[in-house]
């Protein structure tokens, strides 16, 4: 059973490849199946196949197997690229070396050790014998190839074509002799697929019998092909997980190449005065840890016993007691001469890359692998492994653990706004990191907007001028007070959260602010029964350049007839042009005897391109902005309305689609307003609400 389940380990996989037969005489067998494993089982056992199966192709699109009596090295066959195909070739037929006694050898060597040509197995001339192909099914006694059907001591052999010499062994090297590695084999990409005790290696793309993190797609540069021995993690030499359920992993017997040289690509950049990257190439002579304690010699076992010896870690320059990074740690380190302190980092060695200036990310930074570990608010990032439970709480897939090393800024949840990290601070559980998008990177971080133009956008300044007084259900409208005066609008999106604008906070002292809810009059006149006055407990600034702030209330608002929340749009959604929307505010209204009542101005959605034309081409809108024009000339938002909402209705649902932020001018005829597009930041808002703790009512 186990043998059958694991037969795919006996095949070499070539992704996106198929075989096309040029010779029409070559046979093929096809059948619908679910997995490549099923194809492999049948190929290995030759069950129901009218030929000896040497390879197969799994068609992922059609869920179909194509079994072949040939492989890519056979004549009359050519390889072809195809997205939906994966080619699997039985390793025994393409190997030029033997494992152990060579019982499984199915290569094409047909000359003996002394150079005599082999006699075909099906022939009785010049030597009669009982090794007929029909008697040794599965042993591939084809042509006159060297074989070892009984697993005898000397390895593969054949009857010879010389009448004087009945049989002789063939000179086929052991795979462990052919295969060699440099240093500790981190760059080894050979075909050794069994351990030093002879156990077959588990495929890297399989999770049975042993679950592991080294998935080929996660580590495309580690050479995780098929089930070949590799050294992805700085071990003394290559290893693999085994097919033995009781032996998780074992080293492989791969000898060191005679000419122990490395390709340039294998070598980290060598430096002597400073650290490049994680300092794996540091070859300087600093020999104390950061606080001055001297290092222990690498070839010594006192005071600390260890296996980081120069013998185990060749090419890592473990000379004397110099700081080194042989194992892919954060930076160079050493064992110390203090019996109470086993290891320490040599963090006093300066960084060669003296600046964060080069640190940038592309797209949304999901592939960012830099080593910045501080948030934009100056907090040190906390280790990812301590926060996996929290991460699983807000993402619905398995995060790529290979990228989540140490406490470096990363983007495991596909956040549209770049790398971030957890902080360990309960008030600010996570925050973005101060990394910018790479210069010239125009990858859209969101793809389904109307006509996104990636550029440096400019926003239109608007205020509710000449609006109509309103008293309809606008319970989500918030008056943000600064030192007892109205300063900005805001939208209650959750009982404890108000969405508003960055520009509304001239002071950092939260005691300077209050949120007034349930009011119609900016001074609260006549609103005593419905007014709720709440203190502000925290400001959460939006992603860089967003102009948004989520304001956390000191206690949750009580939802009633006068106070309600407003819905958020779906992330990345677009709303059709000409949709009727409204902006609300208590700001400057253009009237001399301003009565202080909440005003509404009716606008309609305008596409970004048309909007730009109305601004005489001076404004290019990007994916984070939304445009709305006034139905009434000179009507729109103004100072004191900043932070307030652009509210639109779709499918009988009202939602906050935009936030009013400062820009240029005020209610200028034919100049539509430009707002922060809430849909672009909806995931950020949900993430904050989900991860930041709020007081219970």
């Amino acid at each position: 059973q186990r043998k059958r389940r694991n037969t795919i380990h006996e095949f070499k996989k070539s992704a996106k490849t198929t075989l096309i037969k040029i010779d029409p005489a070559l046979k093929i067998k096809t059948k619908k199946v679910n997995t490549a494993d099923q194809c492999a089982n049948r190929c290995t056992r030759n069950k129901g196949l009218p030929f000896t199966c040497k390879a197969f192709v799994f068609d992922k699109a059609r869920k179909q197997c194509l079994w072949f009596p040939f492989n890519s090295m056979s004549s009359g066959v050519k390889k072809e690229f195809g997205h939906e195909f994966d080619l699997y070739e039985n390793k025994d037929y393409i190997r030029n070396c033997i494992i152990g006694k060579g019982r499984s050898y199915k290569g094409t060597v047909s000359i003996t050790k002394s150079g005599i040509k082999c006699q075909p197995w099906s022939s009785m001339i010049p030597h009669e014998h009982s090794f007929l192909p029909s008697s040794y099914r599965g042993k591939d006694l084809q042509e006159n190839y060297c074989r070892n059907p009984r697993g005898e001591e000397g390895g593969p052999w054949c009857f010879t074509s010389n009448p004087e010499v009945r049989y002789e062994v063939c000179d086929i090297p052991q795979c462990s002799e052919v295969e060699c590695m440099t240093c500790n084999g981190e760059s080894y990409r050979g075909l050794m697929d069994h351990t030093e005790s002879g156990k077959i290696c588990q495929r890297w793309d399989h999770q049975t019998p042993h679950r592991h993190k080294f998935l080929p797609e996660r580590y495309p540069d580690k050479g995780f092909d098929d089930n070949y021995c590799r050294n992805p993690d700085g071990q003394p030499r290559p290893w693999c997980y085994t097919l033995d359920p009781h032996t998780r992993w074992e080293y492989c017997a791969i000898k060191t190449c005679a000419d122990n040289t490395m390709n340039d690509t294998d070598v980290p950049l060598e430096t002597t005065e400073c650290i490049q990257g994680q300092g794996e190439g540091y070859r300087g002579t600093v020999n104390t840890i950061w606080n001055g304690i001297p290092c222990q010699r690498w070839d010594s076992q006192y005071p600390h016993e260890h296996d980081m010896t120069p013998e185990n870690f060749k090419c890592k320059d473990l000379r004397e007691n110099y700081c080194r990074n042989p194992d892919g740690s954060e930076s160079p380190w050493c064992f110390t001469t203090d019996p109470n302190i086993r290891v320490g980092y040599c963090s006093q060695i300066p960084n060669c890359d003296m600046s964060h200036g080069q640190d940038c990310y592309r797209g949304n930074g999901k592939n960012y692998m830099g080593n910045l570990s501080q948030t934009r608010s100056g907090l040190t990032c906390s280790m990812w492994d301590k926060n996996m439970e929290d991460l699983h709480r807000h993402i619905f897939w398995e995060p790529d653990a290979s990228k989540l090393n140490e406490n470096y800024c990363r983007n495991p949840d596909d956040d549209a706004h770049g790398p971030w990290c957890y902080t360990g601070n309960p008030l600010i559980p996570w925050d973005y990191c101060p990394i910018s998008r790479c210069e010239g990177d125009t990858t859209p971080t969101i793809v389904n907007l109307d006509h996104p133009v990636i550029s440096c956008a400019k926003t239109k300044q608007l205020r509710v001028v000449n609006g109509i007084p309103t008293r309809t259900n606008i319970g989500w409208m918030v008056s943000l007070r600064y030192r007892n005066k109205h300063i900005c609008g805001g939208s209650l999106i959750k009982e404890s959260w108000v969405l508003t604008a960055r520009q509304c906070f001239p002071s950092r002292d939260l005691k300077d602010y209050e949120a007034w809810l349930g009011i119609h009059d900016v001074h609260g006149r006549g609103d005593e029964k419905c007014k709720q006055v709440l203190n502000v407990s925290q400001l959460v600034y939006g992603p860089e350049g967003s102009d948004l702030v989520l304001m956390k209330l000191a206690r949750p608002a009580v939802l009633d007839d006068f106070v309600s929340t407003i819905d958020l749009p779906n992330y990345g959604c677009t709303i059709p042009e000409k949709t009727s929307c409204s902006v609300y505010g208590w700001g400057y209204t253009g009237l001399i005897n301003y009565d202080g009542l909440l005003r509404v101005a009716h606008l309609y959605i305008m596409g970004n391109e048309k909007c730009s034309q109305h601004h005489r081409g001076k404004v290019t809108l990007n994916e984070s902005e939304i445009c709305a024009g006034a139905e009434k000339i000179g009507s729109g938002p103004c100072e004191g309305d900043y932070g307030g909402p652009l509210v639109c209705e779709q499918h009988k649902m009202r939602m906050v689609l935009g936030v009013i932020v400062p820009g240029r001018g005020c209610a200028i005829p034919n100049r539509p307003g430009i707002f922060v597009r809430v849909a672009y930041y909806a995931k950020w808002i949900h993430k904050i609400i989900l991860t930041y703790k709020v007081p219970q009512s």
């Epitope: 934009r376 608010s377 400019k458 005066k485 001239p506 950092r508 102009d547 400057y588 820009g663």
Partner: antibody
Framework: EVQLVESGGGLVQPGGSLRLSCAAS????????MSWVRQAPGKGLEWIGI????????DYASSAKGRFTISRDNSKNTLYLQMNSLRAEDTAVYYC????????????WGQGTLVTVSS | DIQMTQSPSSLSASVGDRVTITCQAS??????LAWYQQKPGKVPKLLIY???TLASGVPSRFSGSGSGTDFTLTISSLQPEDVATYYC????????????FGGGTKVEIK
């Protein structure tokens, strides 16, 4: 390119007035808090005041209160510092600066313009 | 109102030395503190914001720490190009402020 360029500096007599301009390019001044900072010859940086992006009045250092006024013209993307009742101790290089981040630091500075108050 | 006090007003150190400058606020300003570098005849340049976050393009030998009222700017290994005057600035509140900046620290090479 994001930059600020000051102009309007020069020699002025004590008691006189001067208006400094700060033209922005590459960003919209209306979206940011903007500050004026000065530096007397051989002395340190002195904060003059800040203009906000909403209806709140600008804030000034006590040395500038009542004599200096910060304003802006969003249509011209320009910041201004109107200086009245100038004194000899107002002699300095005047810088305008954009207030970035969470409105808490000056990330872009102009090259400065020299104002000399002397009879 | 918030006052910023910087010390020392000047210092002289050798190339490779570790240099520390301190800044004290008269009341808590959380981490809303920035550090600027001004070389002779040049415009001030932002080094560190939010007390410890390195601004873009700034060498990693510069670091900042502190919160509340006490802050520190450290140059781990002084270089000749670091000769300049360094200023701290609070960004906590702008009302009733005499000067948002500290008095400055002039750094020279011995």
């Amino acid at each position: 390119e994001v930059q600020l360029v000051e102009s309007g500096g020069g020699l002025v007599q004590p008691g006189g007035s001067l208006r400094l301009s700060c033209a922005a390019s590459g960003f919209t001044v209306g979206r940011y808090y903007m500050s004026w900072v000065r530096q007397a010859p051989g002395k340190g940086l002195e904060w003059i005041g800040i203009i906000y992006t909403h209806g709140v009045n600008p804030d000034y250092a006590s040395s500038a209160k009542g004599r200096f006024t910060i304003s802006r013209d969003n249509s011209k993307n320009t910041l201004y510092l109107q200086m009245n009742s100038l004194r000899a101790e107002d002699t300095a290089v005047y810088y305008c600066a954009r207030v970035g981040g969470f409105n808490d630091y000056s990330d872009i500075w102009g090259q400065g313009t020299l104002v000399t108050v002397s009879s | 109102d918030i006052q910023m006090t910087q010390s020392p007003s000047s210092l002289s150190a050798s190339v490779g030395d570790r240099v520390t400058i301190t800044c004290q606020a008269s009341e808590s300003i959380s981490t809303y503190l920035a550090w600027y570098q001004q070389k002779p005849g040049k415009v001030p340049k932002l080094l560190i914001y939010r007390a410890s976050t390195l601004a873009s393009g700034v060498p990693s030998r510069f670091s900042g720490s502190g919160s509340g009222t006490d802050f520190t700017l450290t140059i781990s290994s002084l270089q000749p190009e670091d000769v300049a005057t360094y200023y701290c600035q609070q960004g906590y509140s702008y009302s009733n402020v005499d000067n948002a900046f500290g008095g400055g620290t002039k750094v020279e090479i011995k």
